[in-house]
Interface confidence: low
């Protein structure tokens, strides 16, 4: 297979060389080439240049990551960092800060709370939530972290859930929950993390994060 690829590459390279040579001959005004031929070749070349420039712009806009093989399959990845919030909502807040990743505009962090993807496919989605709680100060219910999905035209759905009982340590004991799984996402799908008590979440460096990676 590799040998065939090599032959194909060399053939393409030869065609490119012939094409570039022809342009050169056009520019030097060689008599053996008709004017019409030269015009056609020149406009073809201009078209290529235009395409290259447009691609460059698109790549700049869409990509801070290197493309995987073929422009049809760009790498899509995000990793965001927890953000303390004054809101009482159970949905955790995230930010593009510290050592975060946002590969391109095919994944976005919306309203600081959900990661939204633009391409359909299989994604590995994960979240780590570190919390500090005390059995006496907390309710009887365990601390629960949920990874949820919201798809256009679909109701919210819990993808993953984990529960930890509260620590007896004082003032509180640190514990971490890790959630992760592979799920098919539709264009426009959003994922977010819900917890029973956001006030117990630890926002120190590296403690609480959330991300996804298109497989």
């Amino acid at each position: 297979h590799r040998r065939l690829d090599k032959i194909e590459d060399e053939r393409n390279l030869h065609e490119d060389f012939v094409f570039m040579k022809t342009i050169q001959r056009c520019n030097t005004g060689e008599r053996s080439l008709s004017l019409l031929n030269c015009e056609e070749i020149k406009s073809q070349f201009e078209g290529f240049v235009k395409d290259i420039m447009l691609n460059k712009e698109e790549t700049k806009k869409e990509n801070s990551f290197e493309m995987q093989k073929g422009d049809q399959n760009p790498q899509i990845a995000a990793h965001v960092i927890s953000e303390a919030s004054s809101k009482t909502t159970s949905v955790l807040q995230w930010a593009e800060k510290g050592y975060y990743t946002m590969s391109n505009n095919l994944v976005t962090l919306e309203n600081g709370k959900q990661l939204t993807v633009k391409r359909q496919g299989l994604y590995y989605i994960y979240a780590q939530v570190t919390f500090c709680s005390n059995r006496e100060a907390s309710s009887q219910a365990p601390f629960i972290a949920s990874l949820c999905l919201k798809s256009p035209g679909r109701f919210e759905r819990i993808l993953l859930r984990a529960a930890n009982t509260h620590s007896s340590a004082k003032p509180c004991g640190q514990q971490s929950i890790h959630l992760g799984g592979v799920f098919e996402l539709q264009p426009g799908a959003s994922v977010f993390v819900n917890v029973t008590d956001p006030s117990q979440v630890s926002h120190g460096t590296g403690f609480t994060s959330f991300g996804l990676l298109k497989l």
């Epitope: 309203n111 919201k150 679909r154 109701f155 919210e156 759905r157 819990i158």
Partner: nanobody, 119 residues
């Protein structure tokens, strides 16, 4: 027991407006996303619109975007669908929909209210 009671349907001329309501009971209304689905004569269910628990998230099918507006009043346990610039193809039975707690993309719905758009 979950109860969803739709009202506000009727006969309306093309270009006209209607406001559908859905009175919900038997569950904690504010804890759920809610939505509207419809079924045209001889056709399958079509998703129309959806709203988040606190009203901040809304979704509309392309066919109704810009014409329909979903809203909710959590204090009254009521869901609304304001339908403007109605077209003949909007003729259907409209159902109020609530997700089932642990089911995947399935929902409870009411008896429905018929909307007929005709001149």
């Amino acid at each position: 027991e979950v109860q969803l009671l739709e009202s506000g349907g009727g006969l309306v001329q093309p270009g006209g407006s209607l406001r559908l309501s859905c009175a919900a009971s038997g569950f904690t209304f504010k804890a759920y996303d809610m939505g509207w689905v419809r079924q045209a004569p001889g056709k399958g269910l079509e998703w129309v619109s959806q709203i988040g628990r606190d009203g901040s998230f809304t979704y509309y099918a392309d066919s109704v975007k810009g014409r329909f507006t979903i809203s909710r009043d959590n204090s009254k346990n009521t869901l609304y669908l304001q339908m403007n610039s109605l077209r003949a193809e909007d003729t259907a039975v409209y159902y109020c929909a609530k997700p089932r707690r642990y089911a995947i993309f399935t929902f409870d719905r009411g008896q429905g209210t018929l909307v007929t758009v005709s001149s």
